[in-house]
Interface confidence: low
């Protein structure tokens, strides 16, 4: 077997440092046997069996001229082995951040703070922190610790399912090269870090009859939970086009009747969440949908909905039918919502 | 010495292939990359490809992608590099290279390959 | 694929003198650039690795520089053997790629 520790990372390649001194090991001879040492393509000598350094070659304070390829060879001249020297430095703490886009559910993505050049990869987990009485400060051993699975694809991204809203957990992300490990510690609570996505579909609907009012409409991302025991709340901007300032309502559901909309004028509508206690920040805002309230007067067929009024809207009067509220009911998949035992 | 002996040179018909050997002696064959490049007559260096000889894992130009295979034989300590679909422009001296990934440091003596109807 | 060019075409100068051949990337290949001399009937020899790396057996009078897109190969005295034509290579990016060569003649 050979007499060399195989660091992580490709076969056949060695570790050092730049600045420091490097030891080359010979990988194909009894630990301790003499052997000579050739960069590889040039005749010269680097070290002697004589060396007194066994199956080693050092190199002292290696730069980057010293990287490349070494042959080691036995006393009769046999092929001991050919190893790659890689210089690079040992990991730093890398920079690590937690997000969520519900409640069940968080990810967290790394980066290195300084760049090795050495092959690296991370090792991920977590642990739950739990309380251990109401006035207690002090905590319980961390529950864990878990793997924290990282995404297939190579992203430097790991999430964990599952995880309990009102709980902290501690975040593990290890810098691992053939040179050393090195570990970011990080407390998160899902309350904090909760951003959901921007509402979906939302649609701009004008309102016949009425030409000061647009009817906004939306639904939940799909990536809140379908049962959810935390609701949304909204954020509505909207603004004629060319107007550079937006106005902003906080709709009571998830559509919201706009009733000072320019006459004849697209506007520009968007929306964002937030879950309903106000835990964690605002969505990014939803893609810009656009609508123009209607013109002219109501055709005298069979009224559709929303469209009750047989005069064209000035100024609703104080007894003019309204068209109905925005339904206040919080998510349309909620219909049948009992709590799961 | 590393010595890298090339077969003799060749003249094919359009349409044909030709399968070009180099014999690698004075090291050990299955710890060197080996590359082929060709030189068009008066021409510059085309880099055709090269194969890991203890894994065999190519690199192949893509300009010739879908016409040349490179194979060796560790046994014998000798590449092989085909060509097929012969044109008169793939007229050239082919040569083989002992190297590392990426590097040319020992030629063979070079294949005059002749393509003419 | 990334393009080499050589300049000038022909150089033509006497031994004693000082050789400066030029090669440009079509784009920037850090220092993975290396040169080849070829003698007239020989399989080119590998005379300067990674833009300024010697190697072996190469005579000292042989030298490189440059990054980035633009480098230089200079012999420092001419010797009566240097007269050839030079090529460089890249390993940036597959496919590598030579430059088309610079002639080195007697003046």
């Known amino acids: 077997s050979s007499p060399c520790p195989q660091a992580w990372g490709p076969p056949g390649v060695q570790y050092g440092q730049p600045g420091r001194s490097v030891k080359l090991c010979c990988p194909g001879v009894t630990a301790g046997d003499p052997v000579s040492w050739f960069r590889d393509g040039e005749p010269k000598l680097l070290q002697g069996p004589d060396s007194g350094l066994g199956h080693e070659l050092v190199l002292a304070q290696a730069d980057s001229t010293d990287e490349g390829t070494y042959i080691c060879q036995t006393l009769d001249g046999a092929l001991g082995g050919t190893v790659t020297l890689q210089l690079g430095y040992p990991p730093a703490r890398p920079v690590v951040s937690c997000q969520a886009a519900d409640y069940e559910n968080f990810s967290c993505t790394w980066s290195p703070s300084q760049i090795s050049g050495l092959p690296t990869r991370y090792l991920t987990s977590y642990r739950k922190k739990t309380v251990l009485g109401a006035d207690s400060q002090r905590r319980s051993p961390s529950t864990g610790p878990w793997p924290c699975p990282q995404d297939p694809l190579g992203a430097a991204r790991c999430v964990v399912h599952g995880a309990e809203f009102w709980s902290q957990y501690r975040i593990n992300v290890t810098e691992v090269n053939p040179l050393g490990a090195s570990t970011r510690l990080l407390d998160v609570s899902l309350q904090s870090i909760l951003r959901p996505d921007p509402p979906q579909g939302l649609r701009v609907e004008s309102v016949p009859g009425y030409p000061r009012r647009l009817r906004a409409s939306w639904t939940y991302p799909a990536s809140w939970p379908c049962q959810p025991h935390f609701l949304l709340k909204f954020r509505l901007q909207y603004r004629p086009a060319q107007h550079p300032a937006w106005s902003t309502v906080e709709p009571a559901g998830l559509e919201e009747v706009i009733t000072d909309a320019v006459a004849g004028l697209p506007h520009a509508v968007r929306v964002s969440a937030r879950d309903f206690l106000d835990a964690g920040t605002w969505s990014t805002w939803s893609p810009e949908a656009w609508g123009t309230p209607s013109t002219g007067t109501i055709p005298k067929e069979i009224p559709a909905w929303g469209q009750l009024h047989t005069q064209p809207e000035v100024e609703p009067q104080v007894d003019s039918p309204a068209p109905p509220r925005p339904s206040l009911q919080p998510h349309p998949r909620l219909l049948d919502h009992r709590d799961s035992v | 010495q590393v010595q890298l002996v090339q077969s003799g040179a060749e003249v094919k018909k359009p349409g044909a292939s030709v399968k070009v050997s180099c014999k690698a002696s004075?090291?050990?064959?299955?710890?060197?990359?080996m590359h082929w490049l060709r030189q068009r007559p008066g021409q510059g260096l085309e880099w055709i490809g090269n194969?890991?000889?203890?894994?065999?894992?190519?690199h192949y130009n893509q300009k010739f992608k879908d016409r040349v295979t490179m194979t060796v034989d560790k046994s014998t300590s000798t590449a092989y590099m085909e060509l097929s679909s012969l044109r008169s422009e793939d007229t050239a001296v082919y040569y083989c290279?002992?190297?590392?990934?990426?590097?040319?440091?020992?030629w063979g003596q070079g294949t005059l390959v002749t393509v003419s109807s | 694929d990334i393009v080499l060019t050589q300049s000038p075409a022909t150089l033509s100068l006497s031994p004693g003198e000082r050789a400066t051949l030029s090669c440009r990337a079509s784009?920037?290949?850090?220092?993975?650039l290396h040169w080849y001399q070829q003698k007239s009937g020989q399989a080119p020899r590998l005379l300067i690795k990674?833009?300024?790396q010697s190697i072996s057996g190469i005579p000292a009078r042989f030298s490189g520089s440059g990054s980035g897109t633009d480098f230089t190969l200079t012999i420092s005295s001419l010797e009566t053997e240097d007269f050839a034509v030079y090529f460089c290579?890249?390993?940036?990016?597959?496919?590598?790629?030579f430059g088309q060569g610079t002639k080195l003649e007697i003046k």
């Open positions: 290279a002992r190297g590392d990934y990426v590097l040319f440091t020992y």
């Open positions: 004075g090291y050990t064959f299955t710890n060197y990359w």
């Open positions: 194969i890991g000889p203890s894994d065999s894992k190519t």
């Open positions: 784009q920037s290949i850090s220092n993975n």
């Open positions: 990674y833009a300024s």
């Open positions: 290579q890249q390993s940036y990016s597959w496919p590598l790629t």
